[in-house]
Interface confidence: low
């Protein structure tokens, strides 16, 4: 089982970043930490998408990783996609500090995110509370600014 993974985020514009993943035990939480730059100040949706396909850019990555066929939600919600990691917050310099601990994603097993795509979005994720159908699918987070395939790290 892999205990560490890494993702380099890139897009068509200025947004780029590096995200690390670490899971010490197969059933334990995954620590997600890193940095994303080139964002507008404020909240940006942050999700693992189903496919590790970036052939046509971030759109090829498909929908949120959702092996349990649930509605979209926030990272602390029972009703959420496995890939729902919530939002990252960019400061006035456009840099987001990513410091997350999540017990739903995994680096092995049915919820394994390795080989899938991590995406940072244009707008804030409403965490499924937006009151429209799109909220229950994407959180109304808008376009995909940057993405990268999550790979095994040393």
């Amino acid at each position: 089982m892999a205990t560490k993974a890494v993702c380099v985020l890139k897009g068509d514009g200025p947004v780029q970043g590096i995200i690390n993943f670490e899971q010490k035990e197969s059933n334990g939480p995954v620590k997600v930490w890193g940095s994303i730059k080139g964002l507008t100040e404020g909240l940006h949706g942050f999700h693992v998408h189903e496919f590790g396909d970036n052939t046509a850019g971030c759109t090829s990555a498909g929908p949120h990783f959702n092996p349990l066929s649930r509605k979209h939600g926030g990272p602390k919600d029972e009703e959420r996609h496995v890939g729902d990691l919530g939002n990252v917050t960019a400061d006035k310099d456009g840099v987001a500090d990513v410091s997350i601990e999540d017990s739903v994603i995994s680096l092995s097993g049915d919820h394994c995110i390795i080989g899938r795509t991590l995406v940072v979005h244009e707008k804030a994720d409403d965490l499924g509370k937006g009151g429209n159908e799109e909220s229950t699918k994407t959180g109304n987070a808008g376009s995909r600014l940057a993405c990268g395939v999550i790979g095994i790290a040393q």
Partner: antibody, heavy 117, light 107 residues
């Protein structure tokens, strides 16, 4: 503007504990971690560890494991670093800093802790 | 732990000089490198993050480059206020570690 204001200088005896505070303002406290770094006289910078204000996750340098505790109080936007079982070689200036990804972009003014019998 | 080695440990230079400081990591750290300026009695100041990104408010005479294990901080034209000690810091893995520092002194 972002500011980190630390508590004043302390003089402690060997074996005692010290608790340094760091009050943040000018940004959303829970959106960034807080790192602690020290500098002993005539030495370089030494990273002690960090705490995620969002979920209280901590990561301490092995050297300080078991002797240091980092905490936060979101109601007052204040971070704390407690160091126990002080020794003379813990004499240093202790800095808090806002952790942003892989760097520390704003720093407190530093707190001098002197350990002397 | 990842060791960070800076060179030189000190450099004497004049105003207007181009100064280059190097930092070598004991293993690959990708772009997880920051540079700080530290003056006596003051808090350290972030200059460069993610190896080459200039922190806002920092003069453009400061630049960073490199990835993997070898990194460089360049001051294109040294100014009187630049005399200080400079530190590199890696954030590829915990514990974060600093280089031993490079003191830039007046010649």
């Amino acid at each position: 503007q972002v500011q980190l204001v630390q508590s004043g200088a302390e003089v402690k005896k060997p074996g005692a504990s010290v608790k340094v505070s760091c009050k943040a303002s000018g940004y959303t406290f829970t959106s960034f971690g807080i790192s602690w770094v020290r500098q002993a006289p005539g030495q370089g910078l030494e990273w002690m560890g960090w705490i995620s204000v969002y979920n209280d996750y901590t990561n301490y340098a092995q050297k300080f494991q078991g002797r240091v505790t980092m905490t936060t109080d979101t109601s007052t936007s204040t971070a704390y670093m407690e160091l126990r079982s002080l020794r003379s070689d813990d004499t240093a200036v202790y800095y808090c800093a806002r952790k942003r990804g892989g760097d520390m972009d704003y720093w407190g003014q530093g707190t001098l802790v002197t350990v002397s019998s | 732990d990842i060791q960070m080695t800076q060179s030189p440990s000190s450099v004497s230079a004049s105003v207007g000089d181009r100064v280059t400081i190097t930092c070598r990591a004991s293993q690959d750290i990708s772009s997880w490198l920051a540079w700080y300026q530290h003056k006596p009695g003051k808090a350290p100041k972030l200059l460069i993050y993610l190896a080459s990104s200039l922190q806002s408010g920092v003069p453009s005479r400061f630049s960073g480059s490199g990835s993997g294990t070898d990194f460089t901080l360049t001051i294109s034209s040294l100014q009187p206020e630049d005399f200080a000690t400079y530190y590199c810091q890696q954030a590829n893995s915990f514990p974060w570690t600093f280089g031993q520092g490079t003191k830039v002194e007046i010649k």
